[in-house]
């Protein structure tokens, strides 16, 4: 479960994260698991390790292999794993389905390709795209931020997607590229602004100080496949994953269910030995979509012990 | 307090572009979205589109459709609207305002562009 | 698009007395719908959201009720403060306000 696949080319940055996540002021250790050797953390290493982050600058064939890091706090430590694979670089256009991240759908209304990784980088834009090795060029594609949009989607747009970028390291350049297959559905279905079905607006969520706690954040879409829907948490408007607090986790993967053929997502957020301070929090459930932004907000009261009369 | 604060008045030539900002303070900037309302003289409100900050999505009123852009940069919690070609009926009041499950709450206190050769 | 149509274009009240204004949508907009004030010079106003909700700091004497294409807005007492122009706005799909109804002093 705390184990992640990466993978690269050769003389191309590559920055892993590390799969257990902490506060920002934990520390994080890295090793090579193969021989437990320490991951040096001066930036003038080739592969030196950046708090959760591993950086391969630039990543060599040799890197390959499983490396270990701990994430350490006063109270406990926890290990992650990352499986790291570096390849050589393939000389004709084919992208090998070992170095392909996940697909992607879209239809006519709607298309977005995200470039996969980018987050960890640190990158300025423009990202260049590439369809089967060609440059993208004509007004139909649009390079929007960390994603590719592309207007009037055709069956023929459908192909492997390569996005290029470069990341900057104390003023050093590297060149990153990822690629994804994009496939093209017929869309039967429609889409609307975002219904979310629970939680109710304002709800207070009782919770028992020490024990475990969930939030579910539910929200309908629509009909058929929705591919730019989303549902996610905030706490005080912050992401979960930039909170910051390992005790509260979204759950992984949106499950996309059908009933009364509406397209809908659930996110779950737990929350772990729940603590006084979790009852100060914002808890925002958030539906986002083409149409707009729906936000239904949370706050926890304490559960008062039943009262027993004799 | 709770506030949308947006650039100052422009005076534009037909066929130029205006782009307008609005900065947002005292509260959650990635936990809205933020919309832009033009009203004419004289004339009622207008919805031209709005953006989803979190995600940089923007939906436009298909009227103002390949014309404006709009955007937002979570790092200044600042929303942009930027109108291009522009003509003689894009002189007006641009309002940006905070999306609240679709409903405005929170309004800028507007920019007036007047185009004018 | 969803067309928003308000009646009547301009409404004549004394103060004190009651205001009723109405909006109705080309199509059912459920409870999607909002009512704004705006004064001269200003910028609009949050008054009711879901057709039924008053906004944070709003008086008890403005109510909104309706659902589905009809809509009314009452102001039950009317104050000077009250006379401005009135505009109601669908949110069941893209944003369309109506053409406003203005509100003036018999």
């Known amino acids: 479960k705390f184990s992640k696949q990466s993978w690269g080319l050769e003389n191309e940055a590559l920055i892993v994260r590390c799969p257990r996540q902490g506060k920002p002021s934990y520390t994080v250790d890295w090793y090579y698991s193969q021989t437990n050797k320490s991951i040096p953390t001066q930036e003038r290493n080739r592969v030196f390790a950046s708090g959760q982050l591993l950086k391969f600058l630039p990543a060599a064939v040799a890197d390959s292999g499983i490396y270990t890091c701990i994430v350490r706090s006063p109270t406990f430590n926890r290990t992650g794993y990352a499986n790291v694979t570096i390849y050589k670089k393939q000389s004709d256009c084919n992208v090998p389905d070992y170095l392909m991240y996940s697909t992607v759908s879209g239809s006519e209304k709607n298309s977005k390709i995200y470039c996969p990784t980018i987050d960890l980088y640190n990158w300025t834009a423009p990202l260049e795209w590439f369809k089967n090795c060609q440059a993208l060029q004509g007004s139909r594609y649009r390079a929007h931020k960390s994603f590719l949009v592309i207007d009037n989607v055709m069956t023929e747009d459908a192909g492997d997607y390569t996005c290029k970028f470069i990341h900057n390291e104390n003023g050093a350049n590297y060149s990153v590229t990822a690629t994804r297959s994009f496939t093209v559905k017929d869309e039967q279905g429609f889409s609307l602004f975002p219904v979310i079905g629970a939680p109710a607006q304002n709800e207070i969520k009782e919770v028992e100080i020490g024990k475990n706690a969930n939030l579910t954040c539910s929200a309908c879409f629509g009909k058929g496949t929705q591919f730019l829907a989303a549902v996610l948490w905030q706490l005080n408007g912050t992401k979960i994953t930039d909170f910051g607090e390992p005790r509260i986790q979204q759950e992984e993967g949106q499950n996309q269910s059908f009933s009364n053929g509406l397209a809908c997502l659930d996110m779950v957020l737990r929350i772990a030995d729940v603590k006084e301070e979790d009852l100060l929090l914002q808890y925002d459930c958030l539906a986002l979509n083409l149409h707009g932004l729906r936000r239904h907000t949370v706050r926890l009261s304490r559960k008062n012990p039943i009262d027993h009369h004799s | 307090q709770v506030q949308l604060v947006q650039s100052g008045a422009e005076v534009k030539k037909p066929g130029s572009s205006v782009k307008v900002s609005c900065k947002a303070s005292?509260?959650?900037?990635?936990?809205?979205?933020i919309s832009w309302v033009r009203q004419a003289p004289g004339q009622g409100l207008e919805w031209m589109g709005g953006v989803i900050p979190i995600s940089g999505t923007a939906n436009y009123a298909q009227s103002f459709q390949g014309r404006v852009t709009i955007t937002a940069d979570e790092s200044t919690s600042t929303a942009y609207m930027e109108l291009s070609s522009l003509r003689s009926e894009d002189t007006a009041v641009y309002y940006c305002?905070?999306?609240?499950?679709?409903?405005?709450?929170?309004w800028g206190q507007g920019t007036t562009v007047t185009v004018s050769s | 698009e969803i067309v928003m149509t308000q009646s009547p274009a301009t409404l004549s009240v004394s103060p004190g007395e009651r205001a009723t204004l109405s909006c109705r949508a080309s199509q059912s907009v459920s409870s999607y719908l909002a009512w704004y004030q705006q004064k001269p010079g200003q910028a609009p106003r949050l008054l009711i959201y879901?057709?039924?909700t008053r906004a944070t700091g709003i008086p008890a004497r403005f109510s909104g009720s309706g659902s589905g294409t009809e809509f009314t807005l009452t102001i039950s007492s009317l104050q000077s403060e009250d006379f401005a122009v009135y505009y109601c706005?669908?949110?069941?799909?893209?944003?369309?306000f109506g053409q406003g109804t203005k509100l003036e002093i018999k």
């Open positions: 879901g057709a039924s």
């Open positions: 305002a905070r999306d609240e499950n679709g409903a405005f709450d929170i």
């Open positions: 706005q669908q949110y069941d799909n893209r944003p369309t």
């Open positions: 005292g509260y959650f900037f990635t936990s809205y979205g």
